[in-house]
């Protein structure tokens, strides 16, 4: 049994780090493998993650952490029984993938304006809470070419757009994702999408 693709890990900078790797053949990850992780810190102890299958030869492990601070560094040991298959380290602050925003809502009752709001996925005491910026994706269900991205570079989790920038009388969907420049993170996954029917009064044409 050998590791084909070494584990790579990302942290949500809150309570979970996710590590993925590939073995050289079909593997029952949960019965054959264990990933041990230990914070490099005085008196810390090793903790065990039981991996799950992620495709035939792929494994994924969700490492539970109490919290994360920038100085944290973990040792990782991948075991198959008594055999050490791989040894490495992981610094969560250098491999951050934020949590996806939630509760995306489209408010259509504001005159001729669409107000999109969503929730910051972090609690106020988390460092990323005040460092997230967002991308909002809006697209038409009827027209694949009608696809747009709005970058939200301010901290407030909301976006206002004129309803007239979208076509009237058709359905649109929106989703939002987040990233944090301070830790040069990857983008989060997209939030679940939300759907609304766009309708607004066209201004009278004057001749």
């Amino acid at each position: 049994m050998k590791v084909l693709q070494e584990p790579t890990c990302v942290s949500d900078y809150m309570s979970i780090s996710t590590c993925e790797w590939k073995m050289n053949g079909p593997t029952n990850c949960s019965t054959e493998l264990r990933l041990l992780y230990q914070l490099v810190f005085l008196l810390s102890e090793a903790h065990t993650c039981i991996p799950e299958n992620n495709g035939g030869a792929g494994c994924v492990c969700h490492l539970l952490m109490d919290d994360v601070v920038s100085a944290d560094n973990y040792t990782l040991d991948l075991w198959a029984g008594q055999q050490l298959l791989w040894k490495g380290s992981f610094k969560p602050s250098e491999h951050v993938k934020p949590r996806a925003p939630g509760n995306l809502t489209v408010h259509t009752n504001v005159s001729d304006t669409l107000l999109l709001t969503w929730s910051n996925p972090y609690p106020p005491d988390n460092y990323l809470y005040n460092h997230l910026t967002y991308a909002v994706n809006i697209w038409s269900e009827n027209d694949p070419a009608d696809f747009r991205i709005y970058n939200v570079t301010y901290l407030e989790p909301s976006l206002r757009i004129a309803a007239s920038t979208l076509k009237s009388g058709i359905s649109y969907r929106a989703r939002v994702r987040a990233w944090a420049q301070c830790y040069n993170t990857t983008w989060s996954e997209w939030s679940p999408s939300t759907k609304w029917h766009n309708s607004y009064r066209e201004p009278f044409e004057q001749h």
């Epitope: 008196l43 810390s44 102890e45 919290d67 601070v69 920038s70 100085a71």
Partner: antibody, heavy 125, light 112 residues
Framework: EVQLVESGGGLEQPGGSLRLSCAGS????????MTWVRQAPGKGLEWVSS????????YYADSVKGRFTISRDNSKNTLYLQMNSLRAEDTAVYYC??????????????????WGQGTTVTVSS | DIVMTQSPLSLPVTPGEPASISCRSS???????????LDWYLQKSGQSPQLLIY???NRASGVPDRFSGSGSGTDFTLKISRVEAEDVGFYYC?????????FGQGTKLEIK
């Protein structure tokens, strides 16, 4: 009530051995690291040794390394300090103290928040 | 090893007056984002040490609010807003970020 009670101190000749015990109660003993600190007569406090909750990690002061062994029996809620090759400079009151919570991924530190009453070790010929 | 230096070593105080003890470490005790591994202990005559402050500024359970800790990195201070007769004893700072844990020399607080 959270409590630590040391025992095992006494008078011993140089080169001799003693085993100190520290019985913990009122808290989940296995979840916490434990520490030994000593105080020579008329002197300040000196750290001696620490051990993690499971006993997998042990640390020693240079002055006792190779002579003292820290251990614990979590089934008995008891911490030990085996002291061999004793020297006159080991004469001190020995305290055990409750250290950080090591059952968590990040050891959570509340200070050495509970101390035993101390046990006196005298090394003299 | 990290060297902890306390000052003053002797502190005569009038009851009701404030008192301040300084502790300086030879290396930073800041692990990350507010985790300064510096404690303050009081040892009264004939007793075991007792925890006053942990992680530089957190008051231990049951410690009167006249005791406060501050500082970060290498410079720390213990303040007693109004000294009472029962506060006499030796005050020690201790770092626990690295082994060996190291203590300051101790400050003897006495009543004038």
């Amino acid at each position: 009530e959270v409590q630590l009670v040391e025992s095992g101190g006494g008078l011993e000749q140089p080169g001799g051995s003693l085993r100190l015990s520290c019985a913990g109660s009122g808290f989940t003993f296995r979840d916490y690291a434990m520490t030994w600190v000593r105080q020579a007569p008329g002197k300040g406090l000196e750290w001696v040794s620490s051990i993690s909750g499971s006993g997998s990690n042990k640390y020693y002061a240079d002055s006792v390394k190779g002579r003292f062994t820290i251990s614990r029996d979590n089934s008995k809620n008891t911490l030990y300090l085996q002291m061999n090759s004793l020297r006159a400079e080991d004469t001190a009151v020995y305290y055990c103290a409750k250290d950080r919570l090591t059952s968590r991924v990040r050891p959570y530190y509340y200070g050495l928040d509970v101390w035993g009453q101390g046990t006196t070790v005298t090394v003299s010929s | 090893d990290i060297v902890m230096t306390q000052s003053p070593l002797s502190l005569p105080v009038t009851p009701g007056e404030p008192a301040s003890i300084s502790c300086r470490s030879s290396q930073s005790l800041l692990y990350s984002q507010g985790y300064n591994y510096l404690d303050w202990y009081l040892q009264k005559s004939g007793q075991s040490p007792q925890l006053l402050i942990y992680l530089a500024s957190n008051r231990a359970s049951g410690v009167p609010d006249r005791f406060s800790g501050s500082g970060s990195g290498t410079d720390f201070t213990l303040k007693i807003s109004r000294v009472e007769a029962e506060d006499v004893g030796f005050y020690y700072c201790m770092q626990s970020l690295f082994t060996p844990y190291t203590f300051g020399q101790g400050t003897k607080l006495e009543i004038k």
